[in-house]
């Protein structure tokens, strides 16, 4: 499996996309900030056995499609440009999914493969209620929006590291 | 590693310009906010204002709001600050540091060296 | 605009010596209060974050409480290299906002 450079273009292409689609200076925002508890450890990529880095990766975007695919990310944020990064996203799952199907033929996957994907959904589990617990406010979304760039930038470096290593 | 490095001190004449940059290196640029905080002689610290280098929304403290312009060029990854008139109030030492926005991290964890601005006749 | 003041101005102490200064906040800032060490000609040096959160790399006998208004800075044994003047800030919301500093001198 080869994660090629247009998946990587894919990638930029998402945070960019997630730049655009800010709404309000978030600088109005400041004492919203809430700490989600990045699960970091499952996008260090040391330890990982590459198939699980990439069921992590694939979880990682599907958890994101799933958070701005709701009937109250569809009222946040401009139409348009949501449209263009879920075709982003999908299109990633897609490559990912190949990969996954690719590796497992190769190397088992362990068990603890469900644990870093059970973090992973815990992650975002928190990020859903935190958006509850704030109303879906503008500045919550702002705030949402900037955690979901950075968790997709370690995303990236992962991926950055899988490809050196093929 | 990461770094925030300064320009160098300036001695001015009041009502000329000036333009001090900050630039920094070691970490993704346009991932943190640059602030610019003054440090008159003997005195405490102000804050003046913030840039996101992403875009380059900007805001300022109400005292620094007309006085100063921050700016930054993401493709450099540097941040400025700049006076179109300096006056001898303007004597200070100006620190940049970066910030993380409205991701929860440290604030301020990198700070650059300073730059001695001197402004006299 | 929040107004913070810290007190102490100035306090003279000896090494070893248990340290607390403290930040008052003109309004509820929450827990976005951070502690900044400037020493002469230096830059400052960020301690806490987020009221308690110790900065890496940043000693444990510096500590960090409180929430609402009313914060602490300890240092729990004074040392030579913590004779500096330190800063408290508030990032709650813009202008972000500092104490006018609390300088620490040898007694």
């Known amino acids: 499996c080869n994660l090629s450079q247009t998946h990587s273009l894919n990638n930029r292409r998402t945070l960019m996309l997630m730049a655009q689609m800010r709404r309000i200076s978030p600088f109005s925002c400041l004492k919203d900030r809430h700490d989600f508890e990045f699960p970091q450890e499952e996008f260090d990529g040391n330890q990982f056995q590459k198939a699980q880095a990439i069921s992590v990766l694939h979880e990682m975007m599907q958890q994101t499609f799933n958070l701005f695919s709701t009937k109250n990310s569809s009222a946040a944020w401009d139409e348009t440009l949501l449209e263009k990064f879920y075709i982003e996203l999908f299109q990633q799952m897609n490559d990912l999914e190949a990969c996954v199907i690719q590796e497992v033929g190769v190397e088992e996957t362990p068990l603890m493969n469900e644990d870093s994907i059970l973090a992973v959904k815990k992650y975002f589990q928190r990020i859903t209620l935190y958006l509850m617990e704030k109303k879906y406010s503008p500045c919550a979304w702002e705030v949402v929006r900037a955690e979901i760039m950075r968790s997709l930038s370690f995303s990236t470096n992962l991926q950055k590291r899988l490809r050196r290593k093929d | 590693e990461v770094q925030l490095v300064q320009s160098g001190a300036e001695v001015k004449k009041p009502g000329e310009s000036l333009k001090i940059s900050c630039k920094g290196s070691g970490y993704s640029f346009t991932s943190y906010w640059i602030g610019w905080v003054r440090q008159m002689p003997g005195k405490g610290l102000e804050w003046m204002g913030i840039?996101?280098?992403?875009?380059?929304?900007?805001r300022y403290s109400p005292s620094f709001q007309g006085q100063v312009t921050i700016s930054a060029d993401k493709s450099i990854s540097t941040a400025y600050l700049q006076w179109s008139s300096l006056k001898a109030s303007d004597t200070a030492m100006y620190y940049c540091?970066?910030?993380?926005?409205?991701?929860?991290?440290?604030?301020?964890?990198?700070w650059g060296q300073g730059t001695l601005v001197t402004v006299s006749s | 605009d929040i107004q913070m003041t810290q007190s102490p101005s100035s306090l003279s102490a000896s090494v070893g010596d248990r340290v607390t200064i403290t930040c008052r906040a003109s309004q509820s800032i929450s827990s976005y209060l951070n502690w900044y060490q400037q020493k002469p000609g230096k830059a400052p040096k960020l301690l806490i974050y987020?009221?308690?959160s110790l900065q890496s790399g940043v000693p444990s006998r510096f500590s960090g409480s409180g929430s609402g208004t009313d914060f602490t800075l300890t240092i729990s044994s004074l040392q030579p290299e913590d004779f500096a003047t330190y800063y408290c800030?508030?990032?709650?919301?813009?202008?972000?906002?500092f104490g006018q500093g609390t300088k620490v001198e040898i007694k």
């Open positions: 987020a009221a308690s």
């Open positions: 540091a970066r910030h993380p926005g409205l991701n929860w991290a440290p604030d301020f964890d990198y």
């Open positions: 800030q508030q990032s709650y919301s813009t202008p972000l906002t």
């Open positions: 840039i996101d280098p992403s875009d380059s929304d900007t």
